[in-house]
Interface confidence: low
Amino acid sequence: NLSQDDSQPWTSDETVVAGGTVVLKCQVKDHEDSSLQWSNPAQQTLYFGEKRALRDNRIQLVTSTPHELSISISNVALADEGEYTCSIFTMPVRTAKSLVTVLGIPQKPIITGYKSSLREKDTATLNCQSSGSKPAARLTWRKGDQELHGEPTRIQEDPNGKTFTVSSSVTFQVTREDDGASIVCSVNHESLKGADRSTSQRIEVLYTPTAMIRPDPPHPREGQKLLLHCEGRGNPVPQQYLWEKEGSVPPLKMTQESALIFPFLNKSDSGTYGCTATSNMGSYKAYYTLNVNDPSPVPSSSSTYH
């Protein structure tokens, strides 16, 4: 003896990304010699058993048996969202409803507001916007591996009344370490299934130069050739160099090249050397104390020639 519930069809709610495919599956234990039917939110019949009722090539039959009717809808649009009804025409008619939720995929974010010629310690403000998400997406900011705390995401309904445009801005003080850094705005949304959808803005920061003096060879000896390299860093890179030997008044100006060359080191070359590296952002002076070591021991005459 079958209970009345055996003729009650069942189905499930489905979530699909816009442009994707959703499968609607309806099952019944006792069909009572009746066919299953699927209809859309507008109450138009889609399939009655294995018979197509609506001319829409996106809708295809997957399974039609006395106990199951499954159909697929491809290239799902936001307008397809709503309650789909599975019916079985027993006495009385029994129905089951499947709520189809269509996710709107957020567009690739757009970053605006970048102003070039940022200087160290300036404040930068960037704006990020992404349209088309449903439900509303969330925006996050990062600089390299570091998360930036932007304003909370602002949400605005798109003209279609279904999707949303989200926007956020971030403000931060730039340092010289930010020169060449990428500020990334990422959109987080369930439709992306963890995939990254982001836009980056590379920033340039102008900053005062620094310099370091590097000896080549590192441990110079009397009689050797020595190059002192003045390695200037900055943005812009220093273009002017001035070498001075300290201790004389005024200091002895030696060369305006980035490298100071000693073709043949003397003990008298010992002393403190200064290199001033200059760009249009300013100047920086680095110092190097040169101690000329004794020459390497001369090999004995017996091993000089072979």
Partner: nanobody, 124 residues
């Protein structure tokens, strides 16, 4: 966990000497610059001296030139500040600092890791 630990501070008479040490642990700092800064009571933090990754290039504040010497021993991951001819105005907390990159910088903004500081008091 990056740690910089200063030592060697203390009370010294004017004209005396002290040698400060800064030991680094948690990562190899031998490829990075290192700097000493100081902060006197009621004043801001000021640059004292810095040394590049090889020890070949050093830089000193005007107040430290000729009296202080910065050096490093990469095998011990330690940087030293030898302070001679100390004056009362050298009284301060001395901080060791290291940047997170190889890029040299001689001002405080260029440094990412800081020690807790060691107190140097110059008084008769």
């Amino acid at each position: 966990q990056v740690q910089l630990v200063e030592s060697g501070g203390g009370l010294v008479q004017p004209g005396g000497s002290l040698r400060l040490s800064c030991a680094a642990s948690g990562r190899t700092f031998s490829n990075y610059a290192r700097g000493w800064f100081r902060q006197a009571p009621g004043k801001g933090r000021e640059f004292v001296a810095a040394i590049d990754y090889s020890g070949g290039s050093t830089n000193y504040a005007d107040s430290a030139k000729g009296r202080f010497t910065i050096s490093r021993d990469n095998s011990k991951n330690t940087v030293y500040l030898q302070m001679n001819s100390l004056r009362a105005e050298d009284t301060a907390v001395y901080y060791c600092a290291a940047p997170a990159s190889r890029r040299p910088s001689w001002d405080a903004d260029g440094y990412d890791y800081w020690g807790q500081g060691t107190l140097v008091t110059v008084s008769s």
